[in-house]
């Protein structure tokens, strides 16, 4: 509440993420020609990487490109790639949707398909939709333990969201538990009016908002945090700006004294804590 | 502009970043004692790091320092590190300038040079110039497409710089698109005032503003975001303080049941997303 | 000070850090049955990770979980986890503090003790205490460079924390060198009244405040930031929210055509560089 | 129908060597610990080695040093090299698995046996 008698000052403010979970994930592996049924374990090192602060992402789906090797091969047939003769193809040519670099020449790409050849990681990846439904659809289930220590250094006051007095099995709830610091991460967006099963296939920001409103008069001292939710990322957005939340990122290994790489394209929810609020003494 | 009636609120922002492009690297590869010349594609999860938010890394140059295991070995010539006797080198003393811990002896480096010998990730790394040309001075023609998501608790207002009306094949122009998200990296240093060629041999920190000034009032709303760029790290800088931006990475692997290191030295441009404005409300 | 005639404006703020020094590290190491003394070198590339502006981490102790692959085993035997037949453990059970999907079976751990079978990377993390003293407690003597780049855009300035006249030799000190700006991890520890070598064993969070209070008037100009330092994690914290500091990573590799990891649990101290203060200006 | 399939067995004079092999057929979904027991004449059935997944070994201490357990994850085959024979080795061997057959469905298997016979 604005007490125009006091001395505002905007908080600073440190945060602490911790998630726990594991995911089964069953999908369709192919070795040596042959599909079947794959079935793994996935734990917080294999979905979350080390990242500072104010972030974390949490892997809900992903599209595997293995094997791939520097060399030259057939670029993917998206619309409008397909070639009928070299004159198509321009050596040297980086087209931004393509991975390589054009050898001038038009090659086959399947029994049916013609494409330029490039110089890339081959094969090239294949323009292919994230998995439907999601791989760690179960992330749904996952919890997240928000640490947050403030500051207000002008009022010399410093305070942090977790008292000796909470319980650490406890899960946040809006009307029961709205002090509790561990959250699902199913609830965050049942609380932000968004269905995480649907999210989760192509990734998505989520926010959530931790507002310190503090009267540090010690006559009426109060100084505790507010948790809200709220969705970042544009779910209407046209697909030419990408819509979702992924990355690729790829493990590097030798193999017969050749570099190859598998390449990784994580989609996931990123989750940015974001703290405001003011402190204000008379 | 300042509106003195106004209840004014600083910015709470989120920043997703999107960079695109593919470099042709040739250089010197030594295999065997046979220098030849190298050609590779860089794409971006060659290049890029999935980073947090704020900020985002494309490498432009590097040293590798390939199949260094845990032993002992000369350290490193560098200017005052020549010895003649064992007197001259301390046993368990580490310089900091070198990269591990004397055992104590003078040994040859090669035919002419003698060093401190070291326990050490050996053969310890070179200390030599950065490519230049850099390696991946072609990213200058990268593209990063930069969505914020913009929000003021207080007048519980949210927008973002992407419209539904934009053009998802557009490049920012500060006279002819300067609400188009999509930033030719080549183009932000031209803004600076800056030489992306000449930066991008030892790295740099690039600064990208977002300035939302927003009039929330009804009647004479407005509120979109204004862009404009500055170098951050100081090209002055004197040596002893590190200049350009620069860190080193290491790919791990066994062979012969050796443990072993691929160190990598990469030089590259951090680019920071800084948001700020605020919301003024009658 | 507090100019009341002056119009204030918040600070925008960019940092870059580079934390130098090696760590000796000696521990046990078991191979083929047989435990031996290990000694290893870890330099930046080792213990730090590239990381975004404002938050660095130094990982000052570890454990290791080598070979693990995707199969079934016995869970760890913690409080409460043991078993003495099939009924006490429920297939398709995910336990949030276990590592897997149990089986529904119960299975020896070892010759004393049984445990519900679980689906997960085998075998399981062993639940052992963090090794006491920390493994790189000599990360106290390394240092940090920060390089601080600071904005008040509507006063149109812009300086740094680093002036050209500063000397790269030096140590930060609050009172012979307060302006320099390159730390040892220790004395920040020490200013901040905590022990660098107790924090080492679990990890923490340690706060550097970089606060600049400047007056742009031309007549009486000042614009030089103070540093200071505080623990932000809560070192009295209950064992039910996660005392400390640590994050786990893997390293995936193949063998005998399995893929396996090796699972690091790294402990270590991240310090957040937290930028703030005004520009006045008449 | 899944299957555990030994073969290698024979006489041979103490002091020699013998390789044993073991191969699991039929569908499942992935095969897990692989081990070697034996039973001697009028003793109980005892482990002699047994292999995980990723390879960890664990050996009876009457063969530590002489025999070597070994697997082929793209076969589904588990060896066993044994070396420095002696006429207390004389036993059935006997192949043993965990297998998956499908997600969380562990079942053990077991061989039919093969006869180790050590002449002094």
């Known amino acids: 509440s604005d007490k125009l008698y006091q001395r505002k000052e905007p908080v600073i403010s440190s945060v602490h993420t911790k998630v726990k979970g594991i995911a089964e994930v069953t999908e369709n592996v192919t070795e040596g020609g042959v599909t079947k049924l794959g079935h793994s374990i996935f734990d917080t090192a294999d979905y979350t990487f080390p990242l500072q602060g104010n972030s974390f992402f949490v892997m809900t789906n992903y599209v595997k490109s293995e094997g791939q090797v520097q060399t030259l091969c057939p670029e993917y047939p998206r619309r409008g790639a397909q070639c009928s003769s070299d004159r198509r193809c321009k050596k040297g040519w980086m087209d931004p949707q393509s991975k390589g670099i054009q050898t001038g020449r038009c090659v086959p790409y399947d029994k049916t398909r013609k494409t330029c050849e490039v110089s890339a990681w081959c094969p090239t990846e294949e323009e292919k939709e994230a998995p439907r439904p999601a791989l760690l659809r179960s992330a749904e289930n996952f919890t997240v333990l928000i640490k947050n220590n403030i500051h207000f250094p002008g009022h010399n006051y410093t305070t942090r969201n977790i008292l000796p007095t909470m319980n650490g099995s406890c899960t946040f709830h809006k009307t029961w538990d709205p002090q509790c610091s561990i959250f699902r991460l199913g609830d965050i967006f049942q609380e932000a009016g968004e269905n995480f099963t649907e999210v989760a296939v192509q990734g998505g920001i989520m926010g959530i908002e931790i507002y310190w409103d503090c009267n540090l008069d010690s006559w009426s001292h109060h100084c505790r945090p507010r948790y809200s939710f709220r969705r970042l990322d544009d779910k209407n957005m046209d697909e030419s700006f990408v819509p979702g939340y992924n990355f690729r990122y790829a493990k590097y290994y030798k193999e017969n004294n050749v570099e190859k790489r598998t390449l990784i394209k994580a989609f996931g929810i990123r989750f940015d804590i974001l703290v405001f609020g003011t402190g204000g003494k008379f | 502009s300042d509106k003195l009636y106004q209840r004014k609120e600083p910015v709470i922002s989120s920043v997703h970043t999107k960079v695109k492009g593919i470099a042709e690297v040739t250089e010197n590869v030594t295999e065997g004692g046979v220098t030849k010349l190298g050609h590779s594609i860089f794409d971006t999860a060659d290049y890029t790091f999935p980073l947090q938010g704020n900020s985002f890394f494309v490498m432009t140059n590097y040293v590798k320092s390939e199949g260094q295991v845990q032993t002992l070995c000369p350290e490193y010539p560098r200017r005052g590190a020549q010895c003649s006797s064992d007197r001259r080198c301390k046993k368990g003393w580490m310089d900091p300038q070198s990269k591990g811990i004397q055992t104590g002896r003078c040994v040859p480096y090669d035919k002419t040079r003698k060093t401190c010998e070291v326990s050490a990730w050996c053969p310890t790394e070179e200390e030599k110039e950065a490519p230049r040309p850099a390696l991946l001075r072609s990213a200058e023609n990268f593209t990063v497409l930069i969505k914020n998501n913009i929000h003021f608790p207080g007048h519980n207002y949210t927008t973002r710089n992407i419209l539904p009306t934009m053009n998802g094949s557009c490049t920012f122009h500060k006279t002819w698109d300067p609400q188009c998200s999509i930033f030719r990296l080549g183009d932000i240093f031209q803004e600076a005032g800056e030489n992306f060629t000449e930066v991008a041999v030892q790295g740099g920190i690039m600064g990208i503003e977002i300035y939302w000034d927003c009039n929330l009032d009804s009647w004479s709303h407005h509120c979109r975001p204004r862009y404009s760029f500055r170098r951050l790290d100081d090209k002055n800088m004197d040596e002893s303080f590190v200049p350009g931006y620069n860190f080193r990475y290491a790919k791990y692997y066994k062979e012969n049941n050796v443990e072993k290191r691929t160190l990598i030295k990469a030089f590259g441009i951090r680019f920071d997303i800084l948001v700020f404005g605020t919301g003024g409300k009658f | 000070s507090d100019k009341l005639y002056q119009r204030k404006e918040p600070v925008i703020s960019s940092v870059h850090t580079k934390v130098k020094g090696i760590a000796e590290v000696t521990e046990n190491v078991t191979e083929g049955g047989v435990t031996k003394l290990g000694h290893s070198i870890f330099d930046t590339a080792d213990y730090t990770f590239p990381l975004q502006g404002n938050s660095f981490f130094v990982m000052t102790n570890y454990v290791k979980s080598e070979g693990q692959v995707q199969t079934l085993c016995p869970e760890y035997p913690r409080r409460g986890a043991q078993c003495s037949s099939d009924r006490r453990c429920k297939k398709g059970w995910m336990d949030p503090q276990s590592k897997g999907i149990q089986t529904g079976r119960c299975v020896p751990y070892d010759k004393t003790r049984k445990t519900c079978e679980v689906s997960a990377w085998c075998p399981t993390e062993e639940e052992k205490e963090a090794p006491r003293p920390a493994l790189l407690r000599s990360a106290e003597n390394f240092t940090v460079l920060i390089k601080n780049n600071i904005h008040f855009p509507g006063h149109n300035y812009t300086t740094r924390n680093i002036l050209p006249t500063m000397n790269g030799s030096c140590t930060f000190h609050k009172t012979w060198d307060p302006q320099c700006s390159i730390f040892r991890l220790g004395d920040i520890f020490q200013e901040a009244g905590e022990n660098f070598t107790e924090v080492a064993v679990q990890g923490g969070i340690m706060g550097i405040e970089i606060y600049w209070d400047c007056n742009l008037d031309s007549w009486s100009h000042h614009c030089r930031p103070r540093y200071s330092f505080r623990r932000l994690d809560d070192k009295n914290m209950d064992e039910s929210f996660v005392p400390g500091y640590n994050f786990r990573y893997a390293k995936y590799y193949k063998e005998n055509n399995v893929e396996k990891r090796t699972l690091i649990k790294a402990f270590g101290i991240r310090f957040d560089i937290l930028v703030f203060g005004t520009g006045g200006k008449f | 129908e899944v299957q555990l399939v030994e073969s290698g067995g024979g006489l041979v004079q103490a002091g020699g060597s013998l390789r044993l092999s073991c191969a699991a057929s039929?569908?499942?979904?992935?095969?897990?610990?692989m081990a070697w027991y034996r039973q001697g004449p009028g003793k109980q059935r005892e482990l002699v080695a047994d292999i995980t997944r990723g390879d960890r070994t664990n050996y009876a201490d009457s063969v530590n040093g002489r025999f070597t357990i070994s697997r082929d994850n793209v076969r589904n085959t588990v060896y066993l090299q044994m070396n420095g024979l002696k006429p207390e080795d004389t036993a059935v061997y006997y192949c043993?698995?965990?297998?998956?057959?499908?997600?969380?469905?562990?079942?053990?298997?077991w061989g039919q046996g093969t006869q180790v016979t050590v002449s002094s």
């Open positions: 039929g569908s499942f979904f992935r095969v897990n610990v």
């Open positions: 043993y698995a965990t297998i998956e057959l499908g997600v969380l469905e562990p079942r053990d298997y």
